[in-house]
């Protein structure tokens, strides 16, 4: 497994998909740390397999962004601020 230190903190970085020389597009990228806390009693009662510790993951997403038109004539998001927020997991 990669070392946690290998993953930079959640911050604005150049978006390699849409940036042009002299015209960078920024994207929120990096790692957010998960929070662990004792599972509340009322939550425990609803669990099929009870867990004493609950971990809460967050993901690096845009807190704010502008929509800009880039070369190729399409709109992209140019992120202006980042934060660690609820992860939305992809369901197949």
């Amino acid at each position: 497994a990669p070392d946690v230190q290998d993953c930079p903190e959640c911050t604005l970085q150049e978006n390699p998909f849409f940036s042009q020389p002299g015209a960078p597009i920024l994207q929120c990228m990096g790692c957010c740390f998960s929070r662990a806390y004792p599972t509340p009693l009322r939550s425990k009662k609803t669990m099929l397999v009870q867990k004493n510790v609950t971990s809460e993951s967050t993901c690096c997403v845009a807190k704010s962004y502008n929509r800009v038109t880039v070369m190729g004539g399409f709109k992209v998001e140019n992120h202006t601020a980042c934060h660690c927020s609820t992860c939305y997991y992809h369901k197949s």
């Epitope: 390699p16 998909f17 940036s19 070369m71 190729g72």
Partner: nanobody
Framework: QVQLQESGGGLVQAGGSLRLSCAAS????????MGWFRQAPGKERESVAA????????YYASSVRGRFTISRDNAKKTVYLQMNSLKPEDTAVYTC??????????WGQGTQVTVSS
Amino acid sequence: QVQLQESGGGLVQAGGSLRLSCAASGRTGSTYDMGWFRQAPGKERESVAAINWDSARTYYASSVRGRFTISRDNAKKTVYLQMNSLKPEDTAVYTCGAGEGGTWDSWGQGTQVTVSS
């Protein structure tokens, strides 16, 4: 340039799923970034999702994050867009694109996705 052909569009009810495919042919260097774009009637084309050559890096528009998943199979020269929890506002013509270094110079013809409420 790369030739791109999309498939998988159609009519689906809100909350449903579709999987779009984009097959590449021609000068298909594996270093190409691939992406999905969409254009709704009366609106500008917008980026939806993009993926780099080795699938190590992806991009999603905020409006589709957590609902759409982009993936690629370099052996099949195909990129996919799995679209779940579709909403009426996802209705658009979805076009596949290929590019390098921030320049998107190859486009498919597009496939219509209609989400009814």
